[in-house]
Structure formats: C-alpha cells, structure tokens
C-alpha cells in the first residue's frame, strides 16, 4: 500500500489539515482546565486528571488509551511536622525561622493540598552549624572555595543559590565537599528580571516565592528502588540504603526574603569576585559563620520529609499506523506538577491535548498515519522522570526494535521571545524545513516564516543564515528514550532572550505562583506562542509518522561528529606534554569520523535514487535511518553511569540539564591535572577514545550498503 491509501485526504493537504485544526483557543481552555488545582504525583487529584485525559483522548478518536501504573519511591513533607530553617543563639533558642509556606496568589487562598516548598528526597535531619555561602554550588565554585580560598566545607551547612546547573548536582557537590546540610535559595540576580514587577503584578518572583524540586542523582535509573526494571506488582525492591541517587544530607529550599536574613549576617571571607555576588542587599561574604556580633549564632535545619512507595499513572494513547503499525513515533510530556503547573507542565500538556484532538479529527475523517503514533501523559516527572522511565523499562524490547522517534512535550513556554529546539542531528533538516513552512508569531515578523524570526533572534554560532539548535541534555522525559535506548529525540518550546535575560529558567519556576493567570496575563495572552509550539511539535510528529522516507539526514550527524571531535581534541591538547608522554592519539577517532562522513554521503545519494515503490527496499532504507541513533548506544554504558549509554551525547556530569559531547572522553579529561595517578588517568582517556572511535565506525557501517 502507498502511505495514503487509507485516507480520504489528499497527500499534500494532510499536514495542512492537521495544522489548520490546531486552535489557540482550545489550548487556552485546556490549560485552564489543567491548572485549577494541584496535580502532585502520587495524589488522588493527579489520578483523577489521568482518568480525565484517558476519557478525553478516547473521545478525540484514538484507537486505544490505557493507564500504565507503577509503584515508585516518592517524597513528601510531613503534614504535621513542617520543614524549616532557624538561626539559633548560643542558648539554642530560635531567633529567626524561615517561612513554612508561600503566601498563596490572589484567588487561590482557599485551595487545599498545596505542598509547601521542599527538596524532594531530602533525608530527615536537624543539623546545626556555621554557614558557608558556595555561590551556585557548581564544581568550579567548590574548586574556588577549596583550592583557591582554602575554605573547608566539612561539617558546615552550605547555602547555594539556584541556577546555572541542576539542583541535584549542587547537592552532590556539597556532599562531596563534606557539608552536613544544604540550603537552596532563589537569588534575585537569577530570578528577578530588571524592571518587571513581582507576581501578581508581573512575572517576577516575589520574596516569599520558593522553587521546589527533586535533588536526586539518578543518572537515568528511574525509580530509585528498581533500577533497570519496571516498578510493577512483582518487582524486587532495593532497601533504602541501596537505593539509587538519594542524597545523604538534609536539603531545603527558601525564598530570597528568608535568604536575606541568613546571608546578611555572614562573616569570614569576602566573595572572591563579582560573579559570586547576587542581587540581595548583603555583602555575599562566604563565611564560614556569622560576623562579629553574631558569631555565636548558628543555623539549624529541621527536615522531616518522608520517602514513600506510591502508585503513579501514565496515560498511553495509540493511533495505529496504516502501513507500518510496528513503527512507533512517540509524543510525550508529563502531567504531574509541583503545584498548579501553569507553565510546567500544563502549558505542554495542553498542547499535547490539542495535538491529540487534531489527529483524532483527521482519523474520524478516515485518515491514518503511515506509522503508529503513541501519545503519553507521564506521571512523576518532577520526582526524577519516573513515569516515562518505568514505562520505557517495561517496554524496552519493543521500543528498541520499533522506536522511530520521541518528541518531548513539557512546558511549551519559558519566555515569549523566540523558538528553542534541542534535538538529535538527525532531526535538524526536519526542523528547518518545518519551520520554513510555519508562520512566525513574533511581533515585527508578520507574514514571515518561523524559520526567519528564529534565525534572526537565535542565530547558529557556526552556520550563518541558520538557527541555533542545541544538544539534548536531560532533566526531562526524553532521557530514557535518547540516552538509554538510542531513539532519535527532540524537543521544542518558546524561550526568553538569553542575551538580555540572564536569569535561570523563568522566575516563577516550580513555585505556587506558576498559575494559569501567569500565562494568560503576562506570557501569552493570545496563546499564539502555544499555538506555534503545537505546530512545531505536532508537525514534527506528523512528518515522522507520515513521510514515506523518514525525515532524517545522516549527513548532519557527520558534521557534528567532526565538530565534537575537534572540540574534545582541543581540550586534550591543553596537555601536550602528557599526550606525548602517554602516547595519546585521536587519529582513530578522526579516521572514524571521516569514514562516517563518506559513508553518510553515499547513503544520502542512494536515498535520493532508490525505488520508493519497492516496499522491501523502502523499509530497509528506513530501518537504516531508524537504527542509526541506536548504533551510538554502548550496551555497557558510560563509566559509573550504566543508564547513560549514548556515546556521542550524555547529560553533563556537572549539570544534568546540559548535554555533553563525547562524554566518556570529556569526563576522563576533566580536571586530569589533579589526578593522583596520571598514568592511570591518561590510560582511561585512551580507552575512551577507543570506545568513541569504535562506536562511530560501527555506526558508519550500519549505513553501508547491506551487501
């Protein structure tokens, strides 16, 4: 069958019909519906929303919609024993306590079940001691403290500002430095944009606002008690002492009003440079401890949260493919929120809902996609990507054989300036071609394409006339599909102007103030940016599921492989003497990249010329494209990170949110000058070059003519 035999809509109008059916007004209504009460993972409210989405997706016309449940480790504050931080005097009296909750936003004063700010998976504890300010608690911040300033964090409570890196990395770094507790706070320098009012008068973070979030270091494991396997009814669970990624010291988040009270008394060393100063009205002294008059005062944490095995629910919808039902294109985003989820995740979930509705409308008119489309509403993303990871673990054999692509659909907006895309290089051309066909929603770009406004506002640093597309990192539900299973993945959302807004994420991220009104009043009153994101995400899914030849260009992988090889080589060349001493050569890697480039070029030529009416040859060529991403997977995984198996990309070991290229080599080279056994360290560099070169060569060979 040709791909369009099962439809009564002519091929050239398929995509247009799908896109035309997407409506901003519907996205707005869905967002309102999803944000009126909290939908915390593991709660009854989130289970009810799962059932509502299941029912509506069925009404929209999907072939089947099922709930997939798992029993995973979650974390909650103790309702009768709240978490807080104190300043105590020499007699142990509490002379200052941090707030127990965020002041609720207007109109939400009577909403129940708003979880107070907490750091999910913090252990219980009541440590007390002197405070040390550690800036963002990045690897380089601790290097500065320990190596340059000779400040010892052992036995101290550290206070770190949110931003720059994933909070779990901050906690890991503090643990390694010997801290006995961590206080996380939102500094106005990072979460208060100049000239903008605080919520509810603007989109800035008020002083009582606090960012919630998990502090795990799972490295892709999913449920901490069942790494590698689904947390199903017959699962064998590890004991809590053997659980993956749990922090070992108490952690708690606070807002900047409370942070001002803790930091204004700080003594000890002055900040090393201006990059350690935020925007509080304090000197940003590093400590340890308080200044003269207050030197006998200490900080005490009171953390009573509990970890509990709790049931979570994914919603999985299926739209069966007409021609290749055993090839899956997946659109997934999470449903669980910390509180109302006005942006994270419901701005994404509302877009997925409208995409499902549009596909359902086409299906009701007799159309089917060529390939099967799976839609997912993931649970417990906020607790460590648990819903998506458990489902992928349960279905890994199917996914690794049938998975064509995964498109992520968390928050649709983190600003309203321009498009932001992170994806596999295989999707670059798909994204370029699609955005050239879509209208830009941006002011000043009326009648222009999305590609044009995106390229103007966010130009590629390497290629003129092209937009920036970033590497995939982690911190979202694509992780298991891309980093573990090697399924081509991508994500798209509207973002801020990174040039002028240096704050991290958006100011109200994971706070109680992330409401429907935040979006409707300040970010996207007309929902035109949401609609554009729906068109991009939906358009990518449509093309991936419906194009006769998969819209992957392997030549773009060749280009980035060369770029990444050059980059890692230049990092290594900062140590020319050691490279000579230990006979470190990148020749094998550059040779493999050269071979990949040549073979990819030849494959692309064959792709233009082959007989697309021959279903066997078509399937063969498509399988080579589908399995190319899979070919970059090393079954043994990266050192100490067995679930990060992609050799070309992994989440940075220093920031889960960021992607690192040739991560095995990068980590082997990192801080190599400080290693106690240089011979062993450079031996590991050589081993990682070998693994990378072999993998690139092996991947290239999957694109060679089959016989």
């Amino acid at each position: 069958k040709s791909s369009n035999e099962a439809t009564n809509i002519t091929p050239k109008h398929n995509m247009k019909a799908f896109l035309d059916e997407l409506k901003a007004e519907n996205i707005k209504k869905f967002l309102y519906n999803f944000t009126q009460i909290p939908h915390l993972a593991g709660t009854e409210q989130n289970f009810q929303l799962a059932k509502q989405i299941q029912s509506q997706w069925k009404e929209f016309g999907l072939d089947s919609v099922e709930l997939a449940h798992y029993d995973v480790l979650l974390s909650y504050p103790n309702k009768t024993h709240p978490n807080y931080i104190s300043i105590i005097n020499e007699d142990g009296n509490e002379i200052f306590n941090t707030s127990l909750f965020e002041p609720p936003p207007p109109g939400y004063e009577n909403v129940s079940d708003i979880v107070p700010p907490f750091s999910a998976f913090s252990p219980q504890g009541m440590p007390e001691g002197d405070l040390v300010y550690v800036n963002y608690a990045r690897t380089e911040d601790f290097f500065k403290l320990e190596r340059d300033m000779k400040i010892n964090c052992s036995g101290k409570i550290v206070i770190a500002r949110y931003g720059k890196v994933f909070r779990g990395n901050k906690v890991k770094n503090a643990q390694l430095a010997g801290a006995k507790g961590v206080i996380l706070y939102s500094d106005p320098a990072d979460y208060f944009a100049p000239g903008v009012k605080s919520y509810p008068d603007g989109w800035n973070l008020p002083g009582g606002g606090v960012q919630r979030g998990n502090i795990l270091n799972l490295n892709g494991a999913g449920d901490p008690l069942t790494p590698g396997y689904p947390a199903n009814e017959y699962a064998y669970r590890r004991g809590i002492a053997e659980a993956v990624g749990l922090p070992s010291i108490p952690v708690h988040p606070i807002g900047y009003y409370d942070a001002q009270k803790l930091l204004e008394k700080m003594g000890g060393s002055a900040p090393p440079d201006s990059s350690w100063r935020g925007s509080l009205k304090v000197p940003y002294n590093v400590g340890p401890g308080f200044t003269g008059n207050f030197s006998t005062q200490k900080v005490k944490m009171h953390i009573h949260s509990t970890n509990e095995v709790t049931r979570i629910y994914n919603v999985i919808g299926t739209l069966r493919g007409a021609v290749e039902p055993d090839r899956y294109v997946i659109l997934g985003g999470h449903r669980d929120s910390w509180v109302f989820g006005g942006i994270d995740p419901q701005s994404g979930a509302a877009v997925v809902h409208e995409i499902v509705r549009s596909f359902g409308t086409l299906k009701k008119e007799g159309w089917r996609p060529r390939r099967t489309i799976l839609f997912a509403s993931w649970d417990a993303e906020e607790f460590g990507l648990l819903g998506s990871t458990e489902w992928a673990e349960e279905n890994s054999r199917l996914l690794q054989e049938r998975g064509v692509a995964y498109i992520n659909a968390d928050s649709s907006i983190e600003g309203n300036y321009t498009l932001r895309v992170d994806c596999t290089p295989l999707m670059y051309s798909l994204v370029h071609n699609l955005t050239k066909e879509l209208k830009s929603p941006d002011e000043g770009f009326e009648g222009k394409s999305l590609y044009e406004s995106w390229t103007k506002k966010s130009p590629s640093p390497e290629f003129s006339g092209m937009p920036r597309i970033s590497k995939l990192g982690s911190g979202n539900d694509f992780e298991v599909f891309f980093q573990r299973l090697g399924i081509a993945s991508g994500r798209a959302r509207y973002t801020k102007n990174w040039e002028t807004n240096k704050f991290s994420g958006y100011p109200l991220y994971h706070s109680v103030y992330e409401t429907y009104e935040l979006v409707e009043k300040f970010y996207d009153p007309m929902f035109k940016y949401h609609l554009t994101v729906a068109q991009v995400r939906g358009g990518m899914v449509f093309e991936l599921a419906n194009s006769i030849v998969l819209p992957f260009d392997c030549r773009d992988y060749a280009v980035v492989l060369r770029k990444y090889a050059d980059k890692i080589y230049s990092i290594s060349m900062k140590h020319p003497q050691e490279m000579k001493t230990y006979s470190v050569s990148f020749d094998s890697l550059f040779s493999a990249v050269k071979n990949f480039t040549e073979i990819a070029s030849k494959f692309s030529e064959r792709l233009q010329d082959f007989d697309k009416s021959n279903p066997i040859v078509l399937r063969m060529m498509n399988d080579q494209l589908m399995f190319l991403e899979r070919a970059f997977i090393d079954p043994l995984g990266l050192p100490d990170r067995p679930f990060y198996r992609h050799v070309i990309y992994a989440p940075s070991s220093h920031n889960k949110y960021a992607g690192e290229s040739f991560p095995g080599i990068y980590d082997a080279l990192f801080d190599i000058e400080s290693k106690v056994d240089p011979s062993k360290a450079w031996g590991e560099v050589k081993r990682q070059i070998y693994v990378a070169a072999f993998t690139v060569q092996a991947a290239a060979e999957t694109l060679s003519e089959v016989a």
């Epitope: 008068d201 002083g207 509080l280």
Partner: antibody
Framework: EVQLLESGGGLVQPGGSLRLSCAAS????????MGWVRQAPGKGLEWVSS????????YYADSVKGRFTISRDNSKNTLYLQMNSLRAEDTAVYYC????????????????WGQGTLVTVSS | DIQMTQSPSSLSASVGDRVTITCRAS??????LSWYQQKPGKAPKLLIY???NLESGVPSRFSGSGSGTDFTLTISSLQPEDFATYYC??????????FGGGTKVEIK
C-alpha cells in the same frame, strides 16, 4: 496615568505642626510603598520617610525621627506626613514619591513624583 | 549610614558633548544605584535604576555603569533639554535611601 498630588504645605512657626497629604491615582495604591523626599531651597534632595504598601512598616531619617509620622489610608489612596515640632531647617519643598518596586527587596528608587508642596518654617 | 559623593558638583558642556558624572559610595552597594534628573522648579525624574537599567521612556543617550562603590552616568551626546541637575541615590542600605549632592550640568 499615574498622578501624585501633594497638599497641606504653607507657612508655620517653629514648634508648630502641619499635615501634608498626597492623593494618588492611576495605579493600585496598596501594591506600592510610598515615601516623602524634601529639598531645601537651593539644596539637594533628602529622603525623609517611607511606608510599606500595607502601611505596616514605617521608616524615618534621623533628622525627623520622633517628630514626623508617615501614614496612609489605602481606602482613600492617600499618603500623609504629620509634621510636629517643626524647625527652621525643615523648610523645604516636600515631594511625595512612589516606590518603583524595581528592587526585589527593601525600598527602591522612586519612579513617580508629585509636583511638591512648599513648607516654610519661620517666625 | 552610607554616604554618596558626586563629582563634579557642576560642569559646563556644549550640545553634542559626551558628559560623564561619577558617584562614589562610602561602602559597597552592589548595583543598587539610581540616577535622577531635575530641572528648576520641577520634580526629579528617574533615569536609571540598578546601575545600568534605563527607565522606560528615557532616551538611549543616557547610560549607567558600575558596581560596588564606583558608578558613572554618561550622556553620549548632550542635547539642549539635558541641561539640568543630576542626582545619584543608593537603595542598598534602605532606609535611609541617601542621595548624592548633585551635579549641575550648565551650557558652556
């Protein structure tokens, strides 16, 4: 349009009292801290007093502490400055000013000012 | 209290000139410095806040810089309407929100 209109200034003898008023319009009065700034003839600007949006917190310059009282009536969108025990050195144009809210914490620079009202303390 | 020292106290310049006014704080005030313009018989007008952020509606020829204790207001090309007195103000240690002594910009 934001407007601040001061009234209540005039000539008063040393040791006397005056009450300045500032009628605000064009913005949500309760959302903003407010303050008074004065300028003696031919001199620079001097901050006098500030009050939080709710009226719960008040602050004064050392030169007026114990003599001046700042207050606000949020139902009337009006700011007040009660000035007692006036001295010759209190002679100045008194400006009512809205706190911009640009600083995330504490008081901020003032983005809107009234036209000022002259207070003359003289025998 | 934090003292604010402005210099010069007055200056003469011509239309089109680049004018620089400095303000020094007696202790570090991070970036919590604003600049005002005041014309005779009028209320002050906010030009710049947080050291370098231009208030809405203020011409782009005005710019501010600095952090810690030393700050600068620059008028890149002086216009006839710019002849006025300029004040700096700190809001780091507030209260009191102390002002500098002012700089009078006169026609040469």
């Amino acid at each position: 349009e934001v407007q601040l209109l001061e009234s209540g200034g005039g000539l008063v003898q040393p040791g006397g009292s005056l009450r300045l008023s500032c009628a605000a319009s064009g913005f949500t009065f309760t959302s903003y801290a407010m303050g008074w700034v004065r300028q003696a003839p031919g001199k620079g600007l001097e901050w006098v007093s500030s009050i939080s949006g709710s009226g719960g917190s008040t602050y004064y310059a050392d030169s007026v502490k114990g003599r001046f009282t700042i207050s606000r009536d949020n139902s009337k969108n009006t700011l007040y400055l009660q000035m007692n025990s006036l001295r010759a050195e209190d002679t100045a144009v008194y400006y009512c000013a809205r706190d911009s809210g640009y600083d995330p914490i504490g008081f901020s620079p003032s983005d809107y000012w009234g036209q000022g009202t002259l207070v003359t303390v003289s025998s | 209290d934090i003292q604010m020292t402005q210099s010069p106290s007055s200056l003469s310049a011509s239309v089109g000139d680049r004018v620089t006014i400095t303000c020094r704080a007696s202790q570090s005030i991070n970036r919590y410095l604003s600049w005002y313009q005041q014309k005779p018989g009028k209320a002050p007008k906010l030009l710049i806040y947080a050291s370098s952020n231009l208030e809405s509606g203020v011409p782009s020829r005005f710019s501010g810089s600095g952090s810690g204790t030393d700050f600068t207001l620059t008028i890149s090309s002086l216009q006839p309407e710019d002849f006025a007195t300029y004040y700096c103000q700190q809001s780091y240690s507030s209260p009191p929100l102390t002002f500098g002594g002012g700089t009078k910009v006169e026609i040469k």
